[in-house]
């Protein structure tokens, strides 16, 4: 139940993220905004009217509109977060669940080739669950995860583009490849 109604949210390792509460506007009726990290059922940040805002550690920041900022995301920040908003009578006026997933950003893909057997390799070294795509002269050739190897036969000169991406980042490299007729490397 907890996860089925969660808002899937993606964050990049080492970056900051804002968890914004959809369709919420602060008003005088709001008495309490409480953020919890549900894996350990721990309150991590809280706004209470006429009280000092609570934050469990400095990596959390709570804005006046209820948004929670998590700074410098670490792998153990991946969790299900719950925000509960209460009025002065203790009524739960709004509740949202955020399923925060964290990925490492992809690195720029590296294109290398050999003219001897007209083979090209595209490789991405870093990143969580990268998706690699290879294009030749604008036409999509292949899809893979970390490495693409492609043998081309159509022409000895071509422009290859390789893109690497995941939920939090996208990088690409372009290489014009030209091989001599009988070519060596």
């Amino acid at each position: 139940k907890e996860i089925t109604n969660a808002l899937e949210t993606w964050g990049a390792l080492g970056q900051d993220i804002n968890l914004d509460i959809p369709s919420f506007q602060m008003s005088d009726d709001i008495d309490d905004i409480k953020w919890e990290k549900t894996s350990d059922k721990k309150k991590i940040a809280q706004f209470r009217k006429e009280k000092e805002t609570f934050k469990e550690k400095d990596t959390y920041k709570l804005f006046k509109n209820g948004t929670l900022k998590i700074k410098h995301l670490k792998t153990d920040d991946q969790d299900i977060y719950k925000v509960s908003i209460y009025d002065t009578k203790g009524k739960n006026v709004l509740e949202k669940i955020f399923d925060l997933k964290i990925q490492e950003r992809v690195s720029k893909p590296k294109i290398s080739w050999t003219c001897i057997n007209t083979t090209l390799t595209c490789e991405v070294m870093n990143g969580t669950d990268p998706e690699l795509n290879l294009y030749q002269d604008g036409k999509h050739l292949k899809l893979s995860q970390r490495v693409i190897t492609h043998k081309w036969t159509t022409s000895l000169s071509a422009k290859f583009k390789c893109t690497a991406g995941n939920k939090v980042s996208k990088e690409s490299s372009v290489e014009p490849v030209s091989c001599p007729e009988k070519g060596l490397d």
Epitope: N5, D31, K34, K42, K82, N92
Partner: antibody, heavy 117, light 107 residues
């Protein structure tokens, strides 16, 4: 007037199951967080389970995996399904409406659960 | 879990006395401390929330103070109807733990 009426308690064998109900009236049930709290024969109070207005649940380690809390907002009723019951689960079980920070503003009259061979 | 310790376990007082009940948390809980009264054969009822906030319908002789880890419930002028057990409760984090209670008796 806020009213919480528990039912379903009784005598059960160790390892057995029991389902408690809490009928709520006098307030907008679906908008409030609710909990079950129990009082042992030694009169100690222990939290048993929590459910938010939206149906999100928390359990302490003592009952996790054995007890399941649910709510039917259409029927204004809270349910506590208890299984694999142990003698240490013997207690008076109270249903309560809570505020933002676990304060139990309204309590029912309680229903007695006895786990014994 | 946060451990709540109440003292004394039992308190015998004379009507009209001013009484102080103590509650200590094993770690700081700011003002997230609630007090309950339980009379014989009754359910507990909320007396004070957030360490010092009064509750509608509760007599004004009951008051609370404290912050961090040390808290006090005061009864300004005890009446015979105040007999019962008084519990404090941590409202900071889950599970919200209770103290063992202080039993108030009338001499």
């Amino acid at each position: 007037e806020v009213q919480l009426v528990e039912s379903g308690g009784g005598l059960v064998m160790p390892g057995g199951s029991l389902k408690l109900s809490c009928a709520a009236s006098g307030f907008a049930f679906s908008s409030y967080d609710m909990s079950w709290v129990r009082q042992t024969p030694e009169k100690r109070l222990e939290w048993v389970a929590y459910i938010s207005g939206g149906g999100f649940t928390y359990y302490p380690d003592t009952v996790k995996g054995r007890f399941t809390l649910s709510r039917d907002n259409a029927k204004n009723t809270l349910y506590l399904q208890m299984s694999s019951l142990k003698s240490e689960d013997t207690a008076m079980y109270y249903c309560a409406r809570q505020g933002a920070n676990w304060e139990l503003v309204y309590w029912g009259q309680g229903t007695l659960v006895t786990v014994s061979a | 879990d946060i451990v709540m310790t109440q003292s004394p376990a039992t308190l015998s007082v004379t009507p009209g006395d001013r009484v102080f009940l103590s509650c200590r948390a094993s770690q700081s809980i700011s003002d997230f401390l609630h007090w309950y009264q339980q009379k014989s054969h009754e359910s507990p009822r909320l007396l004070i929330k957030y360490a010092s906030q009064s509750i509608s319908g509760i007599p004004s002789r009951f008051s609370g103070s404290g912050s961090g880890s040390d808290f006090t419930l005061s009864i300004n002028s005890v009446e015979p109807e105040d007999v019962g057990v008084y519990f404090c409760q941590n409202g900071h984090n889950f599970p919200p733990t209770f103290g063992g209670g202080t039993k108030l008796e009338i001499k």
